[in-house]
Interface confidence: medium
Amino acid sequence: MNGRVDYLVTEEEINLTRGPSGLGFNIVGGTDQQYVSNDSGIYVSRIKENGAAALDGRLQEGDKILSVNGQDLKNLLHQDAVDLFRNAGYAVSLRVQHRLQVQNGPIGHRGEGDPSGIPIFMVLVPVFALTMVAAWAFMRYRQQL
């Protein structure tokens, strides 16, 4: 597969209410189960149909979960992370990292599993700057007419 895959990385706080069958998603990851190379973080691998997460609609497959009820998920064994979710109570607050694909180019390949991405400001700032330069140039051109 050729081409570079770039991502906008955004974070979101998602508050879920545990449903009759729980929170309704699966996870992979942990210090003993690094699925993403060089990253022992916890990732959402399945959203179960009609579960609490699916009905809420914000959590997506591939999201990285940074914390549960304020507790950081860094450097946890896989089963310890699972237990943290299972013991999280009725109302569960998740801090999650979404990755939105923004570009496919022919310059190498980042790899689908690589969690690194482009912060949103790194895309928006150059776009804003270009827009301002174009507007300035247009105004100068109109003045010359």
Epitope: V28, S45, R46, E49, F85, E112, G113
Partner: nanobody, 131 residues
């Protein structure tokens, strides 16, 4: 997120062998290795039934009693492909065989058996006829 295409079906004599393949096209930003994969079959006039499954990591496999000892499920994550090798085929193995996928990993709610739960994505099926 996942499109599945099965191949390898056909007409085979009783006692023969077949290898079914299922190639997955995974949405960008996802990886095939995150999905549990399964094979199901549906004979004419019967309900679709579980045949075999393999966990997302490949570390666990599950088989229906009807095919245990005669079939082997395997996966090649580099090729986005899951296989079902079927040996000593019987006329009662005649069916449309479907490949299925669902996100793997561990449920944050409760432990479960890969072979027993509903799957999220399905292929169109490949016909296997044992004469």
């Amino acid at each position: 997120h996942v499109q599945l295409v099965e191949s390898g079906g056909g007409l085979v004599q009783a006692g023969g062998s077949l290898r079914l393949s299922c190639v997955a096209s995974v949405a960008s930003g996802r990886t095939f290795g995150w999905y549990d994969m399964g094979w199901f079959r549906q004979a004419p006039g019967k309900e679709r039934e579980f045949v075999a499954a393999i966990s997302w990591s490949g570390g666990s496999t599950y088989y229906a009693d009807s095919v245990k000892g005669r079939s082997t499920i395997s996966r090649d994550n580099a090729k986005n492909t899951v296989y079902l090798q079927m040996n000593s085929l019987k006329p009662e193995d005649t069916a449309v065989y479907y490949c299925a996928a669902r996100g793997g990993g561990t449920s944050v709610d409760s432990d479960y058996d890969v072979g027993e739960f509903e799957y999220d994505y399905w292929g169109q099926g490949t016909q296997v006829t044992v004469s």
